[in-house]
């Protein structure tokens, strides 16, 4: 069942899902100058059986100008070898994700993907909060929010997190202290995806690394 509202906004904090429950939908959005192919699905869908979950459908973007050229979501096996090293850093977040039954991992980027990812979460999904760089977490309890359903209405639990103006960024569950990365940003800022539902996620490619920096742009 889809969560029909958004995870709570916490001042000076972002959130992400470590894994996505089956039923989660990801919009197939293309960057400016590209559009989803006409026959393409508007969403990727986390589906699975008892033993394995994966993203269904392939997001495909084509140039708005060109009629016949299409860009596929995930590379073919032979292409994967060529792209493996360049994508390694941008997908580091996949390496430490636990394979939870009934959950999908963060889907890899696709060619000409939009500069935001819009997820539609389902009941039972947990998202984890972290203070943005330059702020320190004061925990009163778990820095997480869960989508629950009561009387047919969905709601997210309130994360017990306050971010205060200090220098050390807090970590998502299970993460170690970040090592300095080549461009001076903490690793948690450069190689991990912060995910959301309606909040737009801005992606920027770091100048010195083939890595995505995700920050939430609250509206």
């Amino acid at each position: 069942e889809l969560c029909d509202d958004d995870p709570p906004k916490i001042t000076h904090a972002t959130f992400k899902a470590v894994a996505y429950k089956e039923g989660t939908m990801l919009n197939c959005e293309c960057k400016r100058g590209f559009r989803r192919i006409k026959s393409g699905s508007p969403y990727m869908l986390c589906t699975g059986n008892s033993s394995h979950s994966s993203w269904d459908n392939q997001c495909q973007c084509t140039s708005s100008a060109a009629r016949n050229t299409t860009k596929q979501v995930t590379p073919q096996p032979e292409e994967q070898k060529e792209r493996k090293t360049t994508e390694m850093q941008s997908q580091m977040q996949l390496a430490d994700q636990v394979s939870l039954p009934g959950h999908c991992r963060e889907p890899p980027p696709w060619e000409n993907e939009a500069t935001e990812r819009i997820y539609h979460f389902v009941v039972g999904q947990t998202v984890y909060y972290q203070c943005v760089q330059g702020y320190r977490a004061l925990h009163r309890g778990p820095a997480e929010s869960v989508c629950k359903m009561t009387h047919g209405k969905t709601r997210w639990t309130q994360p017990q997190l306050i971010c205060t103006g200090e220098t050390e960024p807090s970590q998502f569950p299970g993460e170690e202290e970040p090592q300095a990365s080549p461009d001076g940003l903490p690793e948690s800022e450069t190689s991990r995806l912060v995910t959301t539902t309606d909040f737009r996620i801005q992606t920027e490619v770091a100048a010195t690394m083939e890595t995505f920096i995700f920050t939430t742009e609250y509206q």
């Epitope: 069942e1 889809l2 029909d4 509202d5 039923g23 939908m25 819009i118 009941v123 909040f199 509206q219």
Partner: antibody, heavy 116, light 106 residues
Framework: QVQLVQSGAEVKKPGSSVKVSCKAS????????MHWVRQAPGQGLEWMGY????????EYNQKFKDKATITADESTNTAYMELSSLRSEDTAVYYC?????????WGQGTLVTVSS | DIQMTQSPSTLSASVGDRVTITCSAS?????MHWYQQKPGKAPKLLIY???DLASGVPARFSGSGSGTEFTLTISSLQPDDFATYYC?????????FGQGTKVEVK
């Protein structure tokens, strides 16, 4: 008590546009998404899309993506749906419905008739 | 898109009858919700999350099912129950409704 009050019936010419309003009261407008549902004469219900009034984010049924534009005005607690390039097949009753899960409150509906 | 198929499309019944409406989803869904609509009126929430009665709905209404097959039952049809009933899924976008089942006087 929660109320959704929609604007009155409209008769429009083919090719024109119409903007239907839905004024909410009795609850915090920004706490719930507002959905829109269409019902053509003698037909069933079709979900068109929703708006999150607090962020302005919209999600559409692909069938209506080029037809409908959903907006909201926090200051007046009102959601709007504009229909463009009207054709006779757009003749229908349009409902707003409060989200946040199942549609527990609905507007009374707005009949839009497209006729030359 | 998940297609919702209701049967029957029209059901002729008398007061006191036990009435059953079925709704079949083209893919597995988490829950089914049901709405009642009377002519010229907006739909009204009847049953949510497959089997929970909405506020003010009489106990003669019940819902059941799982996966792709769901049922709405009226144990003893009352004069106020003659209406059109719609099943609805909100497990995936686009949200979809069944085509409706009209319960009319026999």
């Amino acid at each position: 008590q929660v109320q959704l009050v929609q604007s009155g019936a409209e008769v429009k010419k083919p090719g024109s546009s119409v903007k239907v309003s839905c004024k909410a009261s009795g609850y915090t407008f920004t706490s719930y998404r507002m959905h829109w549902v269409r019902q053509a004469p003698g037909q069933g219900l079709e979900w068109m899309g929703y708006i999150n009034p607090s962020s302005g984010y919209t999600e559409y049924n692909q069938k209506f993506k080029d037809k409908a534009t959903i907006t909201a005005d926090e200051s007046t607690n009102t959601a709007y749906m504009e229909l463009s390039s009207l054709r006779s097949e757009d003749t229908a009753v349009y409902y707003c419905a409060r989200g946040g899960g199942v549609f527990d409150y609905w507007g009374q509906g707005t009949l839009v008739t497209v006729s030359s | 898109d998940i297609q919702m198929t209701q049967s029957p499309s029209t059901l002729s019944a008398s007061v006191g009858d036990r009435v059953t409406i079925t709704c079949s989803a083209s893919s597995k869904i988490s829950y089914m919700h049901w709405y009642q609509q009377k002519p010229g009126k907006a739909p009204k929430l009847l049953i949510y999350t497959t089997s929970d009665l909405a506020s003010g709905v009489p106990a003669r209404f019940s819902g059941s099912g799982s996966g792709t097959e769901f049922t709405l039952t009226i144990s003893s049809l009352q004069p106020d129950d003659f209406a059109t009933y719609y099943c609805h899924q909100r497990s995936t976008y686009p949200l979809t409704f069944g085509q409706g089942t009209k319960v009319e006087v026999k």
